[in-house]
Amino acid sequence: IWELKKDVYVVELDWYPDAPGEMVVLTCDTPEEDGITWTLDQSSEVLGSGKTLTIQVKEFGDAGQYTCHKGGEVLSHSLLLLHKKEDGIWSTDILKDQKEPKNKTFLRCEAKNYSGRFTCWWLTTISTDLTFSVKSSRGSSDPQGVTCGAATLSAERVRGDNKEYEYSVECQEDSACPAAEESLPIEVMVDAVHKLKYENYTSSFFIRDIIKPDPPKNLQLKPLKNSRQVEVSWEYPDTWSTPHSYFSLTFCVQVQGKSKREKKDRVFTDKTSATVICRKNASISVRAQDRYYSSSWSEWASVPCS
Amino acid sequence: RNLPVATPDPGMFPCLHHSQNLLRAVSNMLQKARQTLEFYPCTSEEIDHEDITKDKTSTVEACLPLELTKNESCLNSRETSFITNGSCLASRKTSFMMALCLSSIYEDLKMYQVEFKTMNAKLLMDPKRQIFLDQNMLAVIDELMQALNFNSETVPQKSSLEEPDFYKTKIKLCILLHAFRIRAVTIDRVMSYLNAS
């Protein structure tokens, strides 16, 4: 058993049918010695008397808010949560496996640049009685500071018969140098509590591996005289690290017909312009990627040909 | 990447082309190592990230773009004790700091070159003959060093009398390649920045 926060305790259980569970001793936080009784949650049934209460915690029915009283007055509370270990592996019931970029990906994180600011998000089908708390650091043995905000509900989607809820959090490394070469990964730890179930999820990454630039901005077309060709031009996104000559991007320019089946023409360039043939009813899209370290491509920025 | 990309102008900063070749070569070598050594811990998540140049050179600090010198987090340990001659210093605008930067890059390349050559000698003794260093990568390191053209003492190739532990050598290769790729990215950024200025 360990303390999650004041008066909230997590009991770790080897979870299998007929498991013996864990013996837990609760102590009433009071100078009083006599006349103390214990109850669980809203029930008035007295579970025991005395300054300490010994319980065998086996299932969720044994978890909850234990309260010690004296003469009708509440003295203190202890909330017991359960953390299930199923055959040596901590349970992951609360969050959905996003399966991207690989199986068992519960937290996904992205950064728009090298400033040390990043966003993580996760999915769940649970709508109520759910709380999250997020901590982060650079490295784990001698951790350096990363400050995270509160996790917020950022999107709701309908997936088949289920509603899916997306939560996200923004974090900022306290002293980040955009040019630094990372040798210690960022660690992100999310504590999730649903009713009386506790779970924790972690992700470990280098900022360089989670970079996803914003799409190029000010995408414009300039027709070339006496030609079906157009000059496409764009700019680096505002959110990208500066100076751009150091933090350079490379670009992919795509001409896509109205039908998804039509052949796509693609050109790669390090410049912020390109000359392409603009077909009728086609659209031109441009996306960006770090020129020197191949992390994710940005989303497409698009303009119609006409 | 499937790259129909414009080639660099011939009149451009002489080291940029070499640094781009270097990054391409080390990235290819790392990819080859990860595929060949699939049963070894060779992914970024599995290895310890060690920098053999740590406390010996300070390329990131010495090559910091002017715009980032205002960022206190970037100025932890600015070293200023490097050799100051070199053929990449084509323009008269070149400052003392730029010379320090380029000499630091040269020292990095020299250290990695020695490590890779020592390692290759060990890998050639492996009866499994599982993996060797790409000669192209070693050649590209050499080309960039020549383009930088700094005079410094030759570092002797380490020789070891004891029987090599091939498992450890292959893991060390992965560690070295990951670190060198990261340094090659920094070198490329620096060359691009210097070329633009």
Partner: antibody
């Protein structure tokens, strides 16, 4: 006393369907994940499928994906395996078992796919 | 397709020590715990070892398990005639959990 009692096995022609049941008693069935495991005659153990305690997630071996469906009725304390498009290679003894560091197995039920 | 490899058979005379190996990889045994099962002819498998080296109550102490790196082993010290059975190791793969990964199985024969 944890008990898993299986039923529903038998002889079936290729391409036909069969449903296996596993009745649980002696524990809070709705709190635990459950597996199906099979063993072809003279062969080793092969995992078939898993279902979470609340039925929210199901996982299948590639060899049965799209043909077998694992389900549970927590109100009846019963686990099911619906098998469709049966093939000769599905012939095996099928076991249900609890998920956890200590597990309990059903007695097994024989499924023979033969024309 | 079995990812955990066991020898097809091992044998010993009563009182001898026999060991069964179970070889896997970094993503399965290297990252997860190992169980061992005994299966007597015509019966369901019985758990012998969990969490690499733990014995459930009721399992004789002549059975012991160990794990090192990407391999595990089961030892029977002082093998007895009633130990003649098939033995399976089981683990998980970190990418496909909760799918159970079983070993290929080992037939233990007690001679004489």
């Amino acid at each position: 006393q944890v008990q898993l009692v299986q039923s529903g096995g038998g002889v079936v022609q290729p391409g036909r369907s069969l449903r296996l049941s596993c009745a649980a008693s002696g524990f809070t069935f709705s709190s635990y994940g459950m597996h199906w495991v099979r063993q072809a005659p003279g062969k080793g153990l092969e995992w078939v499928a898993f279902i979470r305690y609340d039925g929210s997630n199901k996982y299948y071996a590639d060899s049965v994906k799209g043909r077998f469906t694992i389900s549970r009725d927590n109100s009846k304390n019963t686990l099911y395996l619906q098998m469709k498009s049966l093939r000769a290679e599905d012939t095996a003894v099928y076991y249900c078992k609890t998920h956890g560091s200590h597990d309990n197995w059903g007695q097994g039920t024989m499924v023979t796919v033969s024309s | 397709s079995y990812v955990l490899t066991q020898p097809p058979s091992v044998s010993g005379t009563p009182g001898q020590r026999v060991t069964i190996s179970c070889s896997g990889g970094r993503s399965n045994i290297g990252s997860n715990t190992v169980k061992w099962y005994q299966q007597l002819p015509g019966t369901a498998p019985k758990l012998l070892i969990y969490k690499n080296d733990q014995r459930p109550s009721g399992v004789p102490d002549r059975f012991s398990g160990s794990k090192s790196g990407t391999s595990a082993s089961l030892a029977i010290t002082g093998v007895q005639a009633e130990d003649e059975a098939d033995y399976y190791c089981q683990s998980y793969d970190r990418g496909t959990h909760p799918a159970l990964l079983f070993g290929t199985g080992t037939k233990v024969t007690v001679l004489g």
